[in-house]
Interface confidence: low
C-alpha cells in the first residue's frame, strides 16, 4: 500500500475576472482495487447512493474527473447497493480517471478495497482518513471548482501548501 | 482595459544579462500567477518559467533550459514582473513574453506584446 | 515531460473546416489550450481547458480532446483565421507548461 500523494487547487473568481488560486496538499493511500498510477482532474464530489444509479444516462461526466467519495457508518446503510469497490468501478465507468475515498467513518472499507482482486481498476482508486480527510472534505464542500493531482512520489519540487 | 507590456530587450553578447520588464495593468496583479513564454524567430513557443502570487509563497518554477540561469520576480507594489537572464547564450534569442497564467496555472490568458532579446557576438 | 506533435502546416479553402490535432501520450488525461498567433502578434487563446472558449473568440472555433489526440475545429474558416496556432498543456507530472510545435493554417 504505497502512499498517493494528492495536491488540490482550489481556483476563486470574482464578477471582476480576477481570480485567486489556493493549494493544500494532503497524503492517503492507493489501494490493491485500483492502480498505483498519478491522475488528476477536476473534482466531482459523489454522494455514496448517487453511485446506486444503473441508469447509464444519468449523472454521466466528461471523462477526466477524480470523484471523491465520503463513505457513511456501515450502520447507516445496512444492506448498501454496491460494495465500496463496486462503488469505484461505477465511478470509473462513468468516466473518473481516479477516485478517493474518505474513509474516516467506515474504516472496515479499507480491508475491502485493499482485498486481492483478480481484476483491479486500471484507475487509482485512493483512500483517505483522519487530518488529510478534513482537509479535502472541507475543500470539496466548499462547492468551488477544485483540481485534484494524485502521484505516486512526492511532487518533484517542494509545494507551498496552506490549509484550508 | 488587461493590459501586460514588456520592456528591457536589446543586444547582448553571450555569457551577459540583461534585466526584463513587464508592467502590468487592468486587474489585479498581485493575486495572479505570472510567466514568461519565449520565441525564437521563426519557432515555435517555449515556456520559460513562472512566479506564483503571495499565497503562493511566490514559489518559481523553470524549464529546463533556463533553470540556474534566469531569475524570475515581481513587485506586486509596482505591478511589475521581472526576468533576471545570466549567462546568456546564442540559443536564448528569442522575443520574451510575459503572460497572465489561469485555469489552474495552466493556461495564458493575457500576453504582452513581447520584448525582443538577441544573444550575439 | 509530454511532447506535443503537430502537423507543421494545414490548408483548408474559405468556409470549409479546419481540423488541427495535436497528439501526445494519454493526452485526453489532461487539459489542451490552443493559441492563435498572426505574424508579428502576440499569441491570443482561442480555446482554454479542451473546449472551452474565451470570450470575444468566434463561435466558430471548437476544441476535444480525447485518447492521445486533441482536435482544434475551425468550422467555417474565413481568411482572417489564417495563422499559426499552438496547442498547449501543464504537464503536472513535471510541472512544466508545454507547447506544441505550431501548425501554419493557410486559408486558399
Known amino acids: 500500500k504505497e502512499t498517493a500523494f494528492v495536491e488540490v487547487v482550489l481556483f476563486e473568481s470574482s464578477p471582476s475576472g480576477d481570480y485567486t488560486t489556493y493549494t493544500t496538499g494532503l497524503t492517503g493511500r492507493f489501494s490493491r482495487a485500483g492502480a498505483t498510477l498519478s491522475a488528476e482532474g477536476e473534482i466531482v464530489q459523489m454522494h455514496p447512493l448517487g453511485l446506486c444509479n444503473n441508469n447509464d444516462e444519468e449523472d454521466l461526466y466528461e471523462y477526466g474527473w477524480v470523484g471523491v467519495v465520503k463513505l457513511e457508518q456501515p450502520e447507516l446503510d445496512p444492506k448498501p447497493c454496491l460494495t465500496v469497490l463496486g462503488k469505484a468501478k461505477r465511478a470509473v465507468q462513468r468516466g473518473a480517471t481516479a477516485v478517493i475515498f474518505d474513509v474516516s467513518e467506515n474504516p472496515e472499507a479499507i480491508d475491502q478495497l485493499n482485498q486481492g482482486s483478480e481484476d483491479p481498476l486500471k484507475r487509482p482508486v485512493v483512500y483517505v482518513k483522519g487530518a488529510d480527510a478534513i482537509k479535502l472534505m472541507n475543500i470539496v464542500n466548499k462547492q468551488k471548482v477544485a483540481r485534484a493531482r494524485i502521484q505516486h512520489r512526492p511532487p518533484r519540487q517542494p509545494t507551498e501548501y496552506f490549509d484550508m | 482595459e488587461v493590459q501586460l507590456v514588456e520592456s528591457g530587450g536589446g543586444l547582448v553578447k553571450p555569457g551577459g544579462s540583461l534585466r526584463l520588464s513587464c508592467a502590468a495593468s487592468?486587474?489585479?496583479?498581485?493575486?495572479?500567477?505570472m510567466s514568461w513564454v519565449r520565441q525564437a524567430p521563426g519557432k515555435g513557443l517555449e515556456w520559460v518559467g513562472f512566479?506564483?502570487?503571495?499565497?503562493?509563497?511566490?514559489?518559481?518554477e523553470y524549464a529546463a533550459s533556463v533553470k540556474g540561469r534566469f531569475t524570475i520576480s515581481r513587485d506586486d507594489s509596482k505591478n511589475t514582473l521581472y526576468l533576471q537572464m545570466n549567462s546568456l547564450k546564442t540559443e536564448d534569442t528569442a522575443v520574451y513574453y510575459c503572460?497572465?497564467?489561469?485555469?489552474?496555472?495552466?493556461?495564458?490568458?493575457?500576453w504582452g506584446q513581447g520584448t525582443l532579446v538577441t544573444v550575439s557576438s | 515531460d509530454i511532447e506535443l506533435t503537430q502537423p507543421p502546416s494545414v490548408s483548408v479553402s474559405p468556409g470549409q473546416t479546419a481540423s488541427i490535432t495535436c497528439s501526445g501520450d494519454s493526452l485526453g488525461s489532461y487539459y489542451v489550450h490552443w493559441y492563435q498567433q498572426k505574424p508579428g502578434q502576440a499569441p491570443v487563446l482561442v480555446i482554454y481547458?479542451?473546449?472551452q472558449r474565451p470570450s470575444g473568440i468566434p463561435e466558430r472555433f471548437s476544441g476535444s480532446n480525447s485518447g492521445n489526440t486533441a482536435t482544434l475545429t475551425i468550422s467555417g474558416t474565413q481568411a482572417e483565421d489564417e495563422a499559426d496556432y499552438y496547442c498547449q498543456t501543464y504537464d503536472w507530472m513535471y510541472s512544466s507548461r508545454v507547447f506544441g510545435g505550431g501548425t501554419k493554417l493557410t486559408v486558399l
Open positions: 481547458r479542451n473546449k
Open positions: 512566479t506564483k502570487n503571495e499565497v503562493g509563497g511566490y514559489t518559481t
Open positions: 503572460a497572465r497564467a489561469i485555469y489552474y496555472l495552466e493556461a495564458f490568458d493575457v
Open positions: 487592468g486587474f489585479t496583479f498581485s493575486n495572479a500567477w
